[in-house]
């Protein structure tokens, strides 16, 4: 779902069932400790040296709900994910960095904790190079995997 | 194989309830979405909403948020579908069909359909 | 919501022949695009998914193409039992739409 340009962003949300309140995980994974901003979230994987994973998606986005769905259920995406700085942005950043090719979802980015954007870790589809679908979840583990191994590591 | 068993037919009143179930086999049943969709007779194809067994997660077409309510029983791997203050216009063929074998939302494959006619 | 439009509404062919089938989505889709075929009577059977992937078990002659809002459903040739009711339906955004269908016919 691309939200500049297709009606995403202007979801009507009462086509949706009626929600609990949720955490800050919003069902990407409830036992995780998720960020609640992106300043937090820089913050905090600068200073814990710990790589940031940053999952934009949107509540009434079907293939946002799927991949949740295939996230929050895959026991290695879940434990991989503890050595992350964790946030899920269901709005869009000033930072441009944080959409190189597009402000669709869902998408996401690796920044590593020097804070440089991990651009160069990709998903299957060249028009949208952050996109995973549900069949990409072996991809999403290598790539969390090559975020991991930190550009410049600390002495 | 994979297996959608829906029940049978349904003649009711005007203003009455129907719950149409959709009994499923063969795969993983709480990792697949569920959707419905009506035919009405010789017409096309209406996407009615989708459930997610796992939790119980839905998403409805706003044609149908008001009457229709979808759920799923993972003890005995069952989606339903109820349908309140039956009119004449929902007498059609109702059809669960399952998302995708890795979670994803295409519809791949198909009950045999249920008639629900709605005449006084 | 997402408005397809499927064309021709009929399509008179011999078996044998090549068909050509084509759905319009009123904005962008991505590939987000199945085909379905369905035989009076009975339940739609899906025939291709993400615009151009072959469902298992589904013969060969069936290919799908095009992304963003063109996509073109191709029978290379058809075979008796392919006469039916042809319909598209988009899965990239709530709700979910079909197309309002195109029906083979023998000629």
């Known amino acids: 779902k691309d939200i500049t340009v297709k009606s995403g962003a202007k979801k009507d949300t009462k086509d949706s069932a009626p929600k609990l309140p949720q955490t800050l995980s919003r069902g990407w994974g409830d036992q995780l400790i998720w960020t609640q901003t992106y300043e937090e979230a820089l913050y905090k994987s600068k200073t814990s040296n710990k790589p940031l994973m940053i999952i934009h998606h949107l509540d009434e986005c079907p293939h946002s709900q799927a991949l949740k769905k295939v996230f929050a259920e895959n026991k290695e995406i879940q434990k991989l994910a503890e050595q992350f700085v964790l946030l899920n942005l269901v709005y869009e950043t000033t930072d441009k960095h944080l959409s190189p090719d597009g402000q669709y979802v869902p998408r996401i980015i690796f920044v590593d904790p020097s804070l440089t954007v991990r651009a160069d870790i990709t998903g299957r589809y060249s028009n949208r190079l952050y996109a995973y679908e549900p069949s990409d979840i072996a991809l999403l583990l290598d790539n969390m995997k090559k975020a991991l191994k930190l550009l410049k590591t600390e002495l | 194989q994979v297996q959608l068993v829906q029940s049978g037919s349904e003649l009711k009143k005007p203003g009455a309830s129907v719950k149409v179930s959709c009994k499923t086999s063969?795969?993983?049943?709480?990792?697949?979405?569920m959707n419905w969709v009506r035919q009405a007779p010789g017409q096309g194809l209406e996407w009615i909403g989708w459930i997610y067994p796992g939790d119980g997660d839905t998403n409805y077409n706003g044609k149908f948020k008001d009457r229709f309510v979808l759920s799923a029983d993972k003890s005995v791997s069952t989606v339903y579908l109820q349908i309140s203050s039956l009119k004449a216009e929902d007498t059609a063929v109702y059809f669960c069909a399952r998302g995708g074998y890795d979670g994803s939302p295409w519809l791949s494959y198909w009950g045999q359909g249920t008639l629900v006619t709605v005449s006084s | 919501e997402i408005v397809l439009t499927q064309s021709p509404a009929t399509l008179s062919l011999s078996p044998g022949e090549r068909a050509t089938l084509s759905c319009k989505a009123s904005q962008d889709i991505n590939s987000y695009l199945s085909w379905f075929q369905q035989k009076p009577g009975q339940a739609p059977r899906t025939l291709i998914y993400r615009a151009n992937r072959l469902v298992d078990g589904i013969p060969a002659r069936f290919s799908g193409s095009g992304s963003g809002q063109d996509f073109t459903l191709t029978i290379s040739s058809l075979e008796p039992e392919d006469f039916a009711v042809y319909y598209c339906l988009q899965y990239d955004e709530f709700p979910f739409t079909f197309g309002g269908g195109t029906k083979v016919e023998i000629k």
């Open positions: 063969g795969y993983v049943f709480s990792r697949s979405w």
